[in-house]
């Protein structure tokens, strides 16, 4: 008789998804002499314990206090990069800026970047036809669970001149209800960081309005504001322009704002 | 061709609200092209009220527009809507709805919606 | 808000003869993504207004090439280099580099 399996809103786990947590584990530990010590297997066990067996809906940070031990990793404090809705671009740009890291630049971040992965209640199998979708399930599923205890200690890592990747593009520029705006924002510790820089990005029309008035963004000023952390914002009008004189910083066409 | 069709004139009276359209015969450009509205008061020259980019719902007002308009779009009809309240004398104008041609540049412009306001 | 000045208010030219308009704002144009977004509008009586040039020198399209814009920061030119008749009407220079965007006073450009 087949089991009953519980259908969620929500994609299943990526297919041959431990092949891919242990092989992108590897690869960061041989590019990263810094990580070499990590025992990938031991990353792999700890991540797996963390939502096997595990009612998918019921996944709490201290499921993942076992892999965040494993990775613990030192970043520059003062080089940190947070991005909202605006992913590819934020990573295009520590690609080429180097000295800078996004949450996917870690260890643990880049295991699961673009990952799906899930469980059952009392079952070792992971379950790959579906998994709760935040909205329409639950909001304590191992995916969401997971960026929440990644993306806080992130945040509580930084100091000094933090920046933010904003989308431009989108109908609220700053959002509350995003990782980095229910999260990190939150995490930010006043003692540490002195300035967040909000950097906001233009989509590919030219424009010359300065989205850094935007109401969003004048919510974001305020929320930071409270927290006795300093705010500034830049808008960044054409980001092909942007990331090429990241890239050729001696260009001439790049003395002025971009 | 005509491309933005505004709506006809409006005779108010004074303390009243009038809501006047702009339909975009582009319909492939009006969702991601920022529609303005901009004033002409005999005398006064040319006032930016404020513009809307509709996909997003994205607004910017002038200053001095802020509590007088309210901008509004459908992308399912392609028409943009200006809202005026607590209509005045000085209110009475001709209304211009203008897509943007290229990025901040109003390259077409509707026939104008004459409002006046008249006791 | 910035300011546009426009001079003349009124030009009498003949038919054939070279126009020019001056336009002056009350703070540079020059927009910090690199473009100086100064523009200039004909409007002819009882029709709205028609993009002419956009960003100091570039014609729209369908304008003709006797229709030329210069200048850079708070300066600005528009040259009719021979005034034909449809080229009657009142001419508006405006700025959308910063938010409100403003416009001029408008020169009418009428018969001698």
């Known amino acids: 008789v087949p089991r009953w399996r519980q259908q969620w809103s929500g994609p299943g786990t990526t297919k041959r998804f431990p092949e891919t947590v242990l092989a992108r584990c590897v690869k960061y530990t041989e590019i990263h002499p810094e990580m070499r010590h990590v025992d990938c297997q031991s990353v792999w066990d700890a991540f797996k314990g963390a939502f096997i067996s595990k009612h998918p809906c019921n996944i709490t940070e201290e499921d993942y206090q076992p892999l965040m031990k494993l990775g613990t990793q030192t970043v520059p404090c003062n080089k940190i990069l947070l991005w909202s809705r605006i992913k590819d671009l934020a990573h295009q740009f520590t690609q080429v800026q180097r000295d800078m890291f996004t949450l996917e630049d870690t260890l643990l971040g880049y295991l699961a970047d673009d990952l799906t992965w899930c469980g059952e209640f009392n079952t070792s199998k992971i379950n790959y036809q579906s998994c709760p979708d935040w909205r329409k399930d639950c909001s304590n599923n191992p995916v969401s669970v997971f960026w929440k205890t990644v993306s806080r200690r992130f945040a509580e890592a930084a100091c000094d001149v933090v920046h933010v990747m904003l989308n431009g593009s989108r109908s609220k520029i700053f959002d509350k209800n995003s990782t980095f705006g229910s999260v990190e924002v939150h995490n930010l510790q006043p003692e540490k960081v002195q300035t967040l820089e909000a950097w906001v990005i233009h989509g590919g029309r030219e424009d010359s309005r300065d989205l850094c008035q935007d109401p969003t963004i004048k919510e974001l000023e305020s929320i930071i504001s409270k927290r006795n952390i300093q705010f500034s914002c830049k808008n960044i009008y054409r980001p092909d322009k942007f990331l090429q004189c990241v890239k050729n910083p001696e260009d001439s066409s790049c003395t002025s704002e971009i | 061709q005509v491309q933005l069709q505004q709506s006809v004139s409006e005779l108010r009276s004074p303390g009243s609200s009038v809501k006047l359209s702009c339909k975009d015969f582009?319909?492939?450009?009006?969702?991601?092209?920022?529609m303005s509205w901009v004033r002409q008061k005999p005398g006064h020259g040319f006032e930016w009220i404020g513009d809307i980019l509709p996909n997003i719902g994205r607004i910017f007002y002038g200053e001095k527009f802020e509590d007088k308009a309210k901008l509004d779009a459908d992308t399912v009809s392609n028409t943009a809507y200006l809202e005026l309240t607590s209509l005045s004398s000085e209110d009475s104008a001709i209304y211009y709805c203008?897509?943007?041609?290229?990025?901040?540049?109003?390259?077409?412009w509707g026939q104008g919606t004459l409002v006046a306001v008249s006791a | 808000d910035i300011v546009m000045t426009q001079t003349p208010l009124s030009l009498p030219v003949g038919l054939g003869d070279q126009a020019s308009i001056s336009c002056r704002s009350s703070q540079s144009l020059l927009h910090s993504n690199g473009n100086t977004y100064l523009h200039w509008y004909l409007q002819k009586p009882g029709q709205s207004p028609k993009l002419l040039i956009y960003k100091v020198s570039n014609r729209f399209s369908g304008v003709p090439d006797r229709f030329s814009g210069s200048g850079s920061g708070t300066d600005f030119t528009l040259k009719i280099s021979r005034v034909e008749a449809e080229d009657l009407g009142v001419y508006f220079c405006?700025?959308?580099?910063?938010?409100?965007?403003?416009f001029g006073g408008g020169t009418k450009l009428e018969i001698k």
């Open positions: 203008a897509r943007e041609a290229y990025g901040s540049i109003l390259g077409y």
């Open positions: 582009d319909s492939e450009v009006f969702p991601t092209s920022y």
């Open positions: 405006s700025q959308s580099s910063h938010l409100p965007w403003t």
